[in-house]
Interface confidence: low
């Protein structure tokens, strides 16, 4: 059955209640210089309106503080109101390493990110940090890498490993959850000149992730004890016509081309899904496409296989699909899939259909295909036009979390966290945020607060209290003692 009745119950005490933000652009200078300037000024308010320095007078200054960054203050205020336990945000690779290699490290950017993490920890909010979050036409790559063919160039994967190592080194004592790359399976939108471009770029992204994971595993895990994965875009697919076999096959094929494409090499075999490889090859044989998945060497298969500590999925909606044979040598046509918009479904302004049961089906599919592993939903949300009473978002959150709870309680899926997308909306972009672009709170915040404080949807008499374990206390308190050491 698609929908089942709501359940009452709670998520475990160690469940991560998160909120996701995309790339945080580092502030280059703390925006409160008045505390670090030792000079006294007189303001000529009636004349030239300029500040004139008073010579011979020096004031006491205080050391620079993380909260001198105006941006960080705003984020902390928003996070405090969200009452989340985790904050997922992305670093800007191009800001940290403008040259793409370690010859020019932007220390100020790293200081800014360290401030975001450490100030969050003071509020009891842990960070899940994404190293690479391509969101725009120039892909968020350092410019020299972009102009050297970006992800079509295998050396970009090596450059990524060096960047990841720098971040682990600089932030890893405070960050215990890492995402290397956000939605590499969606870069097909950009590398779409041909299927071979798409599959070539994807191959280099997989290698980049694996190199970073292996570096962490070898060099940083022993002391930092964190976990590393990558986030896959993971919408569910349903046959448009459940009575048509070809639609069922199309739905499974969508999942193979969208999720298994990256999950199979990393979680399971070290190679691309056999179904995907065979489907592309059969189209090639029939002259319908000149695409081919890269052939992996034994060394590459060994490099890729097993390089994840948990499964991270970004899930927003369910797509209705049907089979349609398409000619052409691009990823989109290689799949032979057509999407149908079901106008009877509740949808958002960007036409995201609200289909809560899809997330439960997805979680079961992942466990069935890749085994019983820790799963985090690292982004999930909907755009809602309302600037104050965002009812669609409240409905979406309530219903989707219900289905995640069913997956946990009934299906016994090892779901470890849910990260709502996103903290604040951006000007002239679809409104996914809990806060407006000028930082006004929406009513969905209270709704999410209530779910978090209840740890789900408890029976009326059940307690939402969790006993603070020794381990948890140590995580936050000792961390600060270590931090404060001279």
């Amino acid at each position: 059955k698609e929908s089942t009745p709501d359940v009452q119950g709670q998520f475990p005490c160690d469940f991560s209640w998160g909120v996701t933000e995309s790339v945080l652009k580092p502030e280059s200078v703390a925006s409160s210089p008045q505390f670090s300037d030792p000079h006294l000024y007189v303001w000529n308010a009636t004349g030239n309106r300029l500040l004139h320095r008073v010579e011979g007078v020096r004031l006491k200054t205080r050391p620079a503080q993380c909260t001198d960054f105006v941006n960080i203050k705003k984020q902390l205020e928003m996070l405090a109101r969200m009452k989340v336990t985790h904050y997922r945000f992305a670093l800007d690779w191009a800001s940290v390493l403008p040259t793409g290699n370690l010859s020019a490290v932007n220390r100020q950017a790293l200081r800014y990110y360290r401030c975001v993490v450490s100030e969050g920890l003071k509020l009891g909010i842990s960070a899940m940090v994404t190293l690479y979050y391509p969101t725009h036409a120039h892909l968020g790559l350092p410019e020299p890498l972009l102009h050297a063919d970006g992800w079509l160039n295998p050396s970009t994967a090596e450059a990524f490993q060096a960047y990841a190592g720098l971040c682990f080194q600089e932030l890893g004592d405070l960050v215990k959850l890492w995402i290397t790359i956000n939605e590499p399976n969606r870069l097909s939108d950009i590398y779409n000149r041909s299927g071979n471009d798409t599959y070539g770029a994807a191959h280099n992204l997989l290698v980049a992730h694996a190199l970073a994971w292996r570096l962490y595993d070898r060099q940083f895990r022993p002391s930092q004890r964190g976990a590393v994965s990558l986030s896959l875009h993971a919408d569910w697919a349903e046959p448009a016509n459940p009575y048509a076999d070809s639609h069922w096959r199309a739905a499974e094929r969508f999942l193979q081309f969208e999720i298994a494409w990256f999950a199979e090499p990393l979680f399971k075999t070290g190679d691309y899904p056999a179904a995907m490889r065979e489907y592309i090859a059969s189209k090639h044989r029939r002259g319908l496409s000149s695409s081919a998945l890269p052939r992996l060497t034994e060394a590459e298969r060994r490099l890729l296989k097993g390089t994840v500590d948990f499964c991270a999925l970004n899930h927003f909606t369910t797509r209705f699909v049907m089979h349609e044979q398409l000619a052409g040598s691009r990823y989109d046509s290689d799949r032979d899939i057509q999407f149908l918009q079901d106008i009877t479904r509740l949808s958002s302004p960007t036409r995201l259909a609200v289909i809560p049961w899809g997330v439960r089906k997805l979680l079961r599919w992942v466990r069935r295909n890749y085994g019983d592993m820790d799963i985090y939903i690292t982004a999930s949300g909907i755009d809602d036009q309302a600037l104050e009473d965002d009812r669609l978002r409240k409905y979406y959150l309530g219903k989707y979390l219900q289905e995640v709870l069913k997956a946990y309680l009934i299906d016994k899926v090892r779901i470890k966290g849910y990260y709502a997308f996103k903290l604040a909306e951006e000007k002239s972009k679809p409104r996914f945020g809990f806060f407006t672009s000028d930082f006004k709170a929406k009513s969905s915040i209270q709704f999410y607060n209530k779910v978090i404080s209840s740890r789900g949807f408890p029976f009326e008499n059940s307690s939402s209290r969790c006993s603070q374990t020794q381990e948890n206390t140590e995580c936050t308190v000792c961390l600060f003692l270590v931090q404060k050491k001279p």
């Epitope: 800001s95 403008p98 040259t99 290699n101 020019a104 350092p142 410019e143 020299p144 050297a148």
Partner: antibody, heavy 120, light 108 residues
Framework: QIQLQQSGAELMKPGASVRMSCKAS????????IEWVKQRSGHGLEWIGE????????IYNENFRDKATFTADTSSNTAYMQLSSLTSEDSAVYFC?????????????WGQGTLVTVSA | QIVLTQSPAIMSASPGERVTLTCSAS???????LYWYQQKPGSSPKLWIY???NLASGVPGRFSGSGSGTSYSLTISSMEAEDAASYFC?????????FGSGTKLELK
Amino acid sequence: QIQLQQSGAELMKPGASVRMSCKASGYTFSSYWIEWVKQRSGHGLEWIGEIFPGGGSTIYNENFRDKATFTADTSSNTAYMQLSSLTSEDSAVYFCARRGYYDAAWFDYWGQGTLVTVSA
Amino acid sequence: QIVLTQSPAIMSASPGERVTLTCSASSSLSSSYLYWYQQKPGSSPKLWIYGASNLASGVPGRFSGSGSGTSYSLTISSMEAEDAASYFCHQWSSYPLTFGSGTKLELK
């Protein structure tokens, strides 16, 4: 301190080619773009293109694609621009400049310029 | 390509006078990628303003820059003799990179 030192003035015949140099010092040469800019007497500035010495990537203004060729030698910290099939229209001062990235993509250091005169 | 149009082409100003130079872009660009350079005869251009409104190191405080979208300006609050020079706006919002035709500022 950071400097870009350009080669001396050139007097060339129409149809010939000229190669000018731009030697960088005081910073990591391979880590910044080198820009080339043309300025004809009494005219404004015209961007010719850029080279990233670290990987040899080049980007040309379409108007100069068949005219200019950029190269860089990281062992001597020197960038070169060759202009081919010279005509009187190519008589100008040519500047090299260093460029930063993304939100610091301005030309922060300039060479003193190389004057090229094309005359029969 | 983005065409930058500067006006006026030439202007004269007396010492102490307030001067405004304008730069108009043929299509909207991010102010982060709009720069101004000063050039004196026989010299190379010098970065003067970056990100539309930030003064480069060593630029006197009487200079200021503003603007967004397609319209930008450079202002001198009180003209001084050393400000006589040519000023070029420049964009890095899209390729090819382009410069304005320049404004020559003379001392009256």
